[in-house]
Interface confidence: medium
């Protein structure tokens, strides 16, 4: 069956300077290919965080993602500014062999509202 | 305080349409999901559609798609449910449901209305 | 879709008797996990959410646990305004939302 990724939470709200986590879970690794996280859609969605390996400021992983049979790809993203406020997406992608990666599925999104402290 | 008045239902026969709304109150209407949750004679819940408060976001439950369509009107903070060929199965009380605005569970229900599709 | 069933159907008791209702998910849904309370000719009541949670102004007689596919809902000595049918409802999943079939909690 068709991977599935989920995102619980509709909406999270985090004040200014505060650390937030975002929960995505997926039914299956497969097909072989990276979860990444994006902020927006469309021509303005911005790269968030990859579990691939690179290092993003402010943001790491909840759980042990090289643990065998890991499914949480959950993110925490911490010291949060008004400028990280927006929807958030969870994105699952099939490799490619030369070509770019495909994306296949991603969550239903989670928006970050950002309060003054 | 919150409130939901559904209205609209009635005897209708297998095939025809109602149009069912909800009028909300004692809340900002267009910063929440709203659903329609419907509940046959005797049995339990069965969740039918959801709309975002944009009203971008629109799901239905396989036993309604192509026949239900929900809308909304955030100018006059009601909701709407355009119920097409309509079926003996159908036959429920029909609630509108207000979402927490951080999870898809529900914190207030109307009183329901009653739609009974016979011939 | 995830499937959500709930035991015993009917559950006869007394007041005062403790109540200890079951729902069980198809697959986790973590602790994503409400509970309502129907009486006749009414709508539904939010009871519990987040598995644990209790909705506002809801007794503390009732109580919620468990996480992933076990659920229960427990009230700790019944009164006469508990006596209803209580369904669970998952919201882990996008939709479609779904609920349990019920417990119908009647006197002894």
């Known amino acids: 069956t068709e991977v599935k990724v989920t995102q619980p939470e509709k909406s999270v709200s985090v004040a200014a300077g505060d650390s937030t986590i975002l929960n995505c879970t997926v039914t299956s690794l497969l097909p072989v290919g990276p979860i990444r996280w994006y902020r927006g859609v469309g021509q303005s969605r911005l790269l968030i965080y990859s579990f691939t390996g690179e290092h993003f400021p402010r943001i790491r992983n909840v759980s042990d993602t090289t643990k065998r049979n890991n499914m949480d790809f959950s993110i925490r993203i911490s010291n949060v500014t008004p400028e990280d406020a927006g929807t958030y997406y969870c994105v699952k992608f099939q490799r490619g062999s030369s070509e770019p990666d495909t994306e296949i599925q991603s969550g239903g999104g989670t928006e970050v509202y950002v309060l003054a402290k | 305080e919150v409130q939901l008045v559904e209205s609209g239902g009635g005897v209708v026969q297998p095939g025809r349409s109602l149009r069912l709304s909800c009028a909300a109150s004692g809340f900002t209407f267009s910063s929440y999901d709203v659903n329609w949750v419907r509940q046959a004679p005797g049995k339990g819940l069965e969740w039918v559609s959801l709309?975002?408060?944009?009203?971008?976001?629109?799901y239905y439950a396989d036993s309604v798609k192509g026949r239900f369509t929900i809308s909304r009107d955030n100018s006059k903070n009601t909701l709407y449910l355009q119920m097409n060929s309509l079926r003996a199965e159908d036959t429920a009380v029909y609630y509108c449901a207000k979402e927490n605005n951080r999870y898809r569970f529900f914190d207030d229900w109307g009183q329901g209305t009653l739609v009974t599709v016979s011939s | 879709e995830i499937v959500l069933t709930q035991s015993p159907g009917t559950l006869t008791l007394s007041p005062g008797e403790r109540a200890t209702l079951s729902c069980r998910a198809s697959?986790?849904?973590?602790?994503?996990l409400a509970w309502y309370q129907q009486k006749p000719g009414q709508a539904p009541r939010l009871l519990i959410y987040?598995?644990?949670s209790r909705a506002t102004g809801i007794p503390d007689r009732f109580s919620g646990s468990g996480s992933g596919t076990e659920f229960t809902l427990t009230i700790s000595s019944l009164q006469s305004e508990d006596f209803a049918v209580y369904y669970c409802q998952q919201y882990y999943d996008r939709p479609p939302l779904t609920f349990g079939g019920g417990t119908k909690v009647e006197i002894k």
């Open positions: 987040g598995a644990s």
């Open positions: 709309i975002s408060g944009s009203g971008e976001i629109i």
């Open positions: 697959q986790s849904v973590y602790t994503y």
